[in-house]
């Protein structure tokens, strides 16, 4: 679809005569008839196959024709066509004299013709005007012409329809040849595909409008290049979606089981050394002068009664000091200058000579001890409390303060962690030194068999076209991560538009 445009510029008829040579009275009131038709080697009368147009009276005898002439005429003259421009044409321009106001062919005498010109040739579609001048014995006509495409038609022969659009069926303008030119941010054959945010992961991200990056299931982050770990993953990371790879010191399905209580909680006080001994379990090795499960209790060094033979103990900042009774010396008053003759044994102890009387030994009655039977028996010195229990002197008796998990007079009884049936879903409970262990039936896992083991939804290889399968442990379902070029819940469908326009 296009328009043949004819611009009349000047008509010269100096003598004001008709084609017959007869003069016009009072002058030649001139109008034009134009016939556009298919190419003919010899232009002959007949149907104006490409169209016709007439002008009103444009002037008398000789005149210049203004652009867009007034009086209802148009200059350039428009000859629209609704077909592919063939590139060739024939053109007939007739100048007529109008004696009255009726310009219809049947209202004019045949001898009202002033002049007739006929041309033919090739004409390509384009914006440039071709200037021409035709001269006869009595008249001269100067004009120019061109062929341009109608709105929304493009190409060498105006056959290509293209309408710019900016909606969900395309975002483009039209190039001179009728091809589409995508608006910024759009791509694809119909400029219907948005260009995602720069760096948006090719497989894990997509977009619905330009400069956007929407993440596929299992991925997150501005560029959709960070995997989403398993729901509930506490101290873990992932390299593919729904994983939970535990950080150092953590264990369990959700990495929420503390395997490094020492580092994470620092329970041991006063510079004690901490040792991990299982999940949420630890042992503190106290520095000298401290005691308690967490070495939180400060010991007096005299509490261990280090001074012998009745020596008295004095606490000092850097330890202790023994004040020895007469006849004894040494750091702990352990050396004697006495013999049995000096009756060194107290509390009814009997004396026995040693080394030919150089020194002696006291045999103490029950409840007394010490090299001179000078001390009442400390019931805690024999460490009677088992399993790390703390011995406490209570006058004539003693008492064991047991560590968690132990009971009995001497902390000799292990409290059964299994007594309260901690294993879920029919798990079997085993008592251990530092707690308990559950042996889980098929289909369950976790410290207490509380976790239903996920069925591996990916085991049946449900994803097509080399897609990656991920098991969503929270729903026992799978997610297919499609390679580029495939879509669908199983990546079973290739992406692809029909290959070309149907023009």
């Amino acid at each position: 679809s296009g328009v043949f445009q004819l611009q009349l510029q000047e008509f010269i008829n100096e003598r004001g005569v008709l084609a017959s040579g007869r003069p016009c009275e009072p002058g030649c009131r001139t109008f034009f008839r134009v016939c556009l038709k298919h190419f003919q080697a010899v232009v002959s009368p007949g149907p104006c196959t490409f169209g016709t147009v007439s002008t009103p009276v444009l002037g008398t005898n000789s005149f210049a024709v203004r652009d867009d002439s007034s009086g209802g005429g148009r200059n350039p003259l428009q000859l629209p066509f609704n077909f592919t421009w063939p590139g060739t044409f024939s053109l007939i321009i007739e100048a007529w004299h109008a004696p009255g106001d009726d310009l219809r062919p049947e209202a004019l005498p045949p001898d009202a013709l002033i002049s007739k010109i006929a041309i033919q040739g090739s004409l390509a579609v384009g914006q440039n005007w071709l200037l021409d001048e035709q001269t006869s014995t009595l008249t001269r006509l100067r004009y120019s012409y061109r062929v341009i495409c109608s709105d929304n038609y493009y190409g060498d022969n105006c056959s290509r329809l293209c309408k710019k659009r900016n909606d969900h069926f395309g975002h483009y303008v039209c190039q001179p040849d009728g091809n589409l030119s995508c608006l910024p941010g759009w791509t694809g054959e119909y400029c219907q595909q948005p260009i995602c945010l720069s760096g948006c992961h090719e497989q894990n991200g997509y977009c619905s409008k330009p400069a956007e990056c929407l993440c596929r299931p299992g991925w997150q982050g501005r560029l959709c290049n960070e995997c989403i770990p398993h729901n509930g993953c506490r101290h873990g990371t992932c390299s593919t979606p729904w994983q939970c790879t535990c950080d150092e010191g953590w264990g369990g399905l959700f990495c929420d089981q503390d395997l490094n209580y020492c580092t994470h909680h620092s329970p041991c006080k006063n510079g004690a050394t901490c040792s991990n001994s299982g999940q949420r379990s630890y042992t503190c090795t106290c520095r000298p002068g401290y005691t308690g499960v967490d070495c939180e209790l400060e010991l007096s060094e005299c509490d261990s009664n280090p001074c012998r033979n009745g020596g008295s103990c004095k606490d000092q900042e850097d330890g202790y000091h023994c004040l020895c009774p007469p006849g004894y010396y040494g750091l702990h008053c352990e050396h004697s200058t006495l013999s049995c003759a000096d009756s060194p044994c107290f509390n009814g102890g009997s004396c026995r000579e040693r080394n030919q009387g150089a020194n002696y030994a006291c045999e103490c009655p029950p409840n007394f001890t010490g090299s001179n039977c000078e001390k009442k028996v400390d019931r805690c010195t024999s460490n009677p409390c088992a399993n790390g229990g703390q011995c406490l002197n209570r006058g004539p008796s003693r008492m064991c303060r047991c560590r968690p998990g132990f009971t009995g007079t001497y902390c000799e009884l292990h409290v059964s962690d299994c007594a309260r049936n901690p294993c879920a879903h029919g798990g079997t409970c085993h008592d251990l030194e530092n707690g308990l262990m559950c042996t889980c039936p098929a289909g369950f896992s976790g410290r207490r068999c509380e976790v239903r083991t996920s069925i591996d939804a990916c085991a049946s290889s449900p994803c097509f076209n080399r897609a990656t399968c991920y098991t969503d442990l929270s729903t026992d379902t799978f997610v297919c991560n499609c390679p580029y070029g495939f879509v669908g819940s199983r990546c079973e469908f290739p992406v692809g538009l029909p290959p070309s326009f149907p023009w």
């Epitope: 119909y190 219907q192 538009l497 029909p498 149907p502």
Partner: antibody
Framework: EVQLQESGPGLVKPSETLSLTCTVS??????????WGWIRQPPGKGLEWIGD???????YYNPSLKNRVTISVDTSKNQFSLKLSSVTAADTAVYYC?????????????WGQGTLVTVSS | SYELTQPPSVSVSPGQTASITCSGE??????VSWYQQKPGQSPVLVIY???KRPSGIPERFSGSNSGDTATLTISGTQAMDEADYYC?????????FGSGTKVT
């Protein structure tokens, strides 16, 4: 050849939500180059475009219905759905689902057979 | 909102040409589709992108679009062409249908 089939209740009470599903067979709803639309026709009247959706979930709605309409897609079931809330008697119509093709400039080349939904108490 | 106006009805004798118009502001700058709907049936696409025919649509159906008016022409109209005809265009992201023309 692709075929479309609407399904859903034929009677809905005023103020309730109209829900319809269109099942696509003979082709994938995830094919690029197609939008999946809903059009309705009140008895004895003309066609009215409701909205459409792309397989990625992009939706476009008629502004006159926008605050009441939701269109969604389920690629795993090869279906797309229409929900129209707060219905009145004026929403009584035959509801069609259709495939709009990019290469046809948005022309709808395949239609379902339509389902009549009556809004009445 | 954008509106497309069609004459309510057009009468034509068998074998003659029927022309159905569809008017809208600057409609020539938009692509127009035409649908045929027979009683009790779903619409059928007969013209897309102003003047193109889908496969299976007879050559007697043709379309044009310029200025503010699109036209569907049925040459050599047959009895089977008796139906309602709707024009449709896209105004931005919104589909718009004409009011429909009954051809008898």
């Amino acid at each position: 050849e692709v075929q479309l089939q609407e399904s859903g209740p034929g009677l809905v009470k005023p103020s309730e939500t109209l829900s319809l599903t269109c099942t696509v067979s003979g082709g994938s709803i995830s094919s690029s180059g197609y939008y999946w639309g809903w059009i309705r026709q009140p008895p004895g009247k003309g066609l009215e475009w409701i909205g459409d959706i792309y397989y990625t979930g992009n939706t476009y709605y008629n502004p006159s219905l926008k605050n009441r309409v939701t269109i969604s897609v389920d690629t795993s079931k090869n279906q797309f759905s229409l929900k129209l809330s707060s219905v009145t008697a004026a929403d009584t119509a035959v509801y069609y689902c259709a495939r709009e093709e990019v290469i046809l400039g948005g022309g709808a080349d395949q239609w379902g057979q339509g389902t009549l939904v009556t809004v009445s108490s | 909102s954008y509106e497309l106006t069609q004459p309510p009805s057009v009468s034509v004798s068998p074998g003659q040409t029927a022309s159905i118009t569809c008017s809208g502001e600057s409609l020539g700058d938009k692509y127009v589709s035409w649908y045929q709907q027979k009683p009790g049936q779903s619409p059928v696409l007969v013209i897309y992108e102003d003047s193109k025919r889908p496969s299976g649509i007879p050559e007697r159906f043709s379309g044009s679009n310029s200025g503010d008016t699109a036209t569907l022409t049925i040459s050599g109209t047959q009895a089977m062409d008796e139906a309602d005809y709707y024009c449709q265009a896209w105004d931005g992201e919104t589909g718009v249908f004409g009011s429909g023309t009954k051809v008898t």
